[in-house]
């Protein structure tokens, strides 16, 4: 499988936004690339979001996706929003070179995203 690199740990912002870079070493001259973010919890794997893009073009996720991203060469900058403490977990970047053949697939080791819910503001008496 293709080599895919991603940071080991990322801390989400107080607004529940986490960003990380997913970088892959392409063996060939792919024109169509698919990037998928998977969340692994114990033995369960769920798809968080996915986008297919043409090399040189922008990465487009579905309108209702919690992910956004930009691409530059063999690097994809991913942002996941709307995260809450319960979403803390291992987020895996999966990259597939879809076209032209041959098909290549790579799986990153995962980024542990920590999300801390903000403390509610105390009521003020003024």
């Amino acid at each position: 499988a293709m080599h895919v690199a991603q940071p080991a740990v990322v801390l989400a912002s107080s607004r529940g936004i986490a960003s990380f870079v997913c970088e892959y070493a392409s063996p060939g001259k792919a024109t169509e690339v698919r990037v998928t973010v998977l969340r692994q919890a114990d033995s369960q794997v769920t798809e968080v979001c996915a986008a297919t893009y043409m090399m040189g073009n922008e990465l487009t996720f579905l309108d209702d996706s919690i992910c956004t991203g930009t691409s530059s060469g063999n690097q994809v900058n991913l942002t996941i929003q709307g995260l809450r403490a319960m979403d803390t977990g291992l987020y895996i970047c999966k990259v597939e070179l879809m076209y032209p053949p041959p098909y290549y697939l790579g799986i990153g080791n995962g980024t542990q995203i920590y999300v801390i819910d903000p403390e509610p503001c105390p009521d003020s008496d003024f």
Partner: antibody, heavy 115, light 108 residues
Framework: EVQLVESGGGLVQPGRSLRLSCTAS????????MNWVRQAPGKGLEWVAQ??????????YYSDSVKGRFTISRDDSKSIAYLQMNSLKTEDTAVYYC??????WGQGTTVTVSS | DIQMTQSPSSLSASVGDRVTITCGAS??????LNWYQQKPGKSPKLLIY???NLADGMPSRFSGSGSGRDYTLTISSLQPEDVATYYC??????????FGGGTKVEIK
Amino acid sequence: EVQLVESGGGLVQPGRSLRLSCTASGFTFSDNWMNWVRQAPGKGLEWVAQIRNKPYNYETYYSDSVKGRFTISRDDSKSIAYLQMNSLKTEDTAVYYCTGGMDYWGQGTTVTVSS
Amino acid sequence: DIQMTQSPSSLSASVGDRVTITCGASEIIYGALNWYQQKPGKSPKLLIYGATNLADGMPSRFSGSGSGRDYTLTISSLQPEDVATYYCQKILSPPPWTFGGGTKVEIK
């Protein structure tokens, strides 16, 4: 049209050597990780070896059953992959397929190891 | 090493039947799975790549699904030309890139 043509198979005695060749055409050979997969008579498919391409420093991988006996190599200038098979055993008897990525397959060449 | 367990090892179905073949990995493989079709006396052909993508030139009655450890190949309406042995293969590093044991599909 994509073509992978294997050659070099035949009948060989146990302990002897054989070199298989895989000549590719119709696709960009240098973009492909090349594999050898074998199939013993009446049995399933067994992955044997893989050689990656230049961006991956021509890394090689082998199944445990052939490690230390078989060597995979490639010549990108000729679009040929090779499988050097030494110390052959009767259990190496099989049809050997060459594959480009896992997308393209050759027609196979038969290797029979028998005394 | 990750083991690939395919079932059934053989099946016989009627033309037009829906046929399902399963492949289970001993560990999570994140959709890193291909399916191949091998007709009698022929070389294998790539059928499905990346668990769900239909290879060029393959009929749309074939589909792949699954995630995690469990994967399925489905033939929505079996045709006489689908008589073959079907193999799954794990394509996730590290090696070996193990094949399942195969499923021989015949027509009743």
